[in-house]
């Protein structure tokens, strides 16, 4: 009786149960009642990643530097290229197939978490007691200056974008 | 019992043609593949022909397609190869096989063609 | 056309001895290598599938090894009956192919 369903790593054809393609290696022939299933491996630049019976491998992914992008792992028979983005730059997604400049944290903003190849800059604004006069793609926000320590006075108070600043206390005459 | 019992040898003169027979029993002949194995006189192991249970597919090696042509009957629980055009060198005893497992786990006893003027 | 080598042409032993019989295929055909027995006279017997899968009836000295491109029939312990020619059959790809026959006789 011939079969109807086959076992793991295998797939129906025919009315018979053939071997799928290891990864790495395409399908040339289906088996018959003869000969097993009849693979090659992949060429140079491609890949199958699982069990299959494809009769074509797929092409690595090409990093394109014109995109932001360079290769952060290199693809294998079995694996696709991994791209990520060159210093600065950040995927615009999961698949990382173009690149954009880091954001910037503008004045009164200071930086949470530092872009990576795959994640944008995370901007905070800065709370009471802290500021941000520049726009930085890597720094925090500041602590205004403490007066009382330099046995100084705040003559003007600081902001989410400015220092405070501190002048001599006044003698008593 | 598993028997193939192979039919229709003898001496035949190059260029003329010869049809081999085998009578399958003791199994469904039709859920099997067979096959044609030959091996010339104090020679090795050479594959002839191969055809599916169902007698649709058929294989050849490049030496004999066009020459060869393997079939079956069901029916009759029977195997053929029509051989064409025959020279010298298909000197051979002719095996019948059955494929089980992709292996040719049964064979027949042999049939002589012996090609010769 | 993948092509299978046998080695040695011949082989000289005595009886309870061990039999290394080798096979190469000229590239990888995985397991996808049979070896058959053939006496004088007789039609081959299937002794070994999938390069060392044992078949049913075949007694237990005699095993298979091997994967890729270099295969190995073993007797463990030469018989008297063991005395015969030894074939290595791929079927892997079309054409199926033969090696061109291991003879193990006495020594």
């Known amino acids: 009786e011939p079969p109807t369903a086959c076992r793991e790593k295998q797939y129906l054809i025919n009315s018979q149960c053939c071997s799928l393609c290891q990864p790495g290696q395409k399908l040339v022939s289906d088996c018959t009642e003869f000969t097993e299933t009849e693979c090659l491996p992949c060429g140079e630049s491609e890949f199958l990643d699982t069990w299959n019976r494809e009769t074509h491998c797929h092409q690595h992914k090409y990093c394109d530097p014109n995109l932001g992008l360079r290769v952060q792992q290199k693809g294998t028979s079995e694996t696709d290229t991994i791209c990520t983005c060159e210093e600065g730059w950040h995927c615009t997604s999961e698949a990382c197939e173009s690149c954009v400049l880091h954001r910037s944290c503008s004045p009164g903003f200071g930086v949470k978490q530092i872009a990576t190849g795959v994640s944008d800059t995370i901007c905070e604004p800065c709370p009471v007691g802290f500021f941000s006069n520049v726009s930085s793609a890597f720094e925090k926000c500041h602590p205004w200056t403490s007066c009382e320590t330099k046995d100084l006075v705040v003559q003007q108070a600081g902001t989410n974008k400015t220092d405070v600043v501190c002048g001599p206390q006044d003698r008593l005459r | 019992e598993v028997q193939l019992v192979e039919s229709g040898g003898g001496v035949v003169q190059p260029g003329r043609s010869l049809r081999l027979s085998c009578a399958a029993s003791?199994?469904?002949?039709?859920?099997?593949?067979m096959s044609w194995v030959r091996q010339a006189p104090g020679k090795g192991l050479e594959w002839v022909a191969s055809i599916s249970s169902g007698g649709d597919d058929t294989y050849y090696p490049d030496n004999v397609k066009g020459r060869c042509t393997i079939s079956r009957d069901n029916s009759k629980n029977t195997l053929y190869l029509q051989m064409n055009s025959l020279r010298a060198e298909d000197t051979a005893v002719y095996y019948c096989?059955?494929?089980?497992?992709?292996?040719?786990?049964?064979w027949g006893q042999g049939t002589l063609v012996t090609v010769s003027s | 056309e993948i092509v299978l080598t046998q080695s040695p042409a011949t082989l000289s032993l005595s009886p309870g001895e061990r039999a290394t019989l080798s096979c190469r295929a000229s590239q990888s055909i995985r397991d996808n290598l049979h070896w058959y027995q053939q006496k004088p006279g007789q039609a081959p017997r299937l002794l070994i599938n999938y390069a060392s899968q044992s078949i049913s009836g075949i007694p237990a000295r005699f095993s298979g090894s091997g994967s890729g491109t270099d295969f190995t029939l073993t007797i463990s312990s030469l018989e008297p009956e063991d005395f015969a020619v030894y074939f290595c059959?791929?079927?892997?790809?079309?054409?199926?192919?033969f090696g061109q026959g291991t003879k193990v006789e006495i020594k």
């Open positions: 096989t059955r494929a089980g497992g992709k292996a040719m786990d049964y």
């Open positions: 059959q791929q079927f892997n790809s079309w054409p199926l192919t």
């Open positions: 003791g199994f469904t002949f039709s859920n099997y593949g």
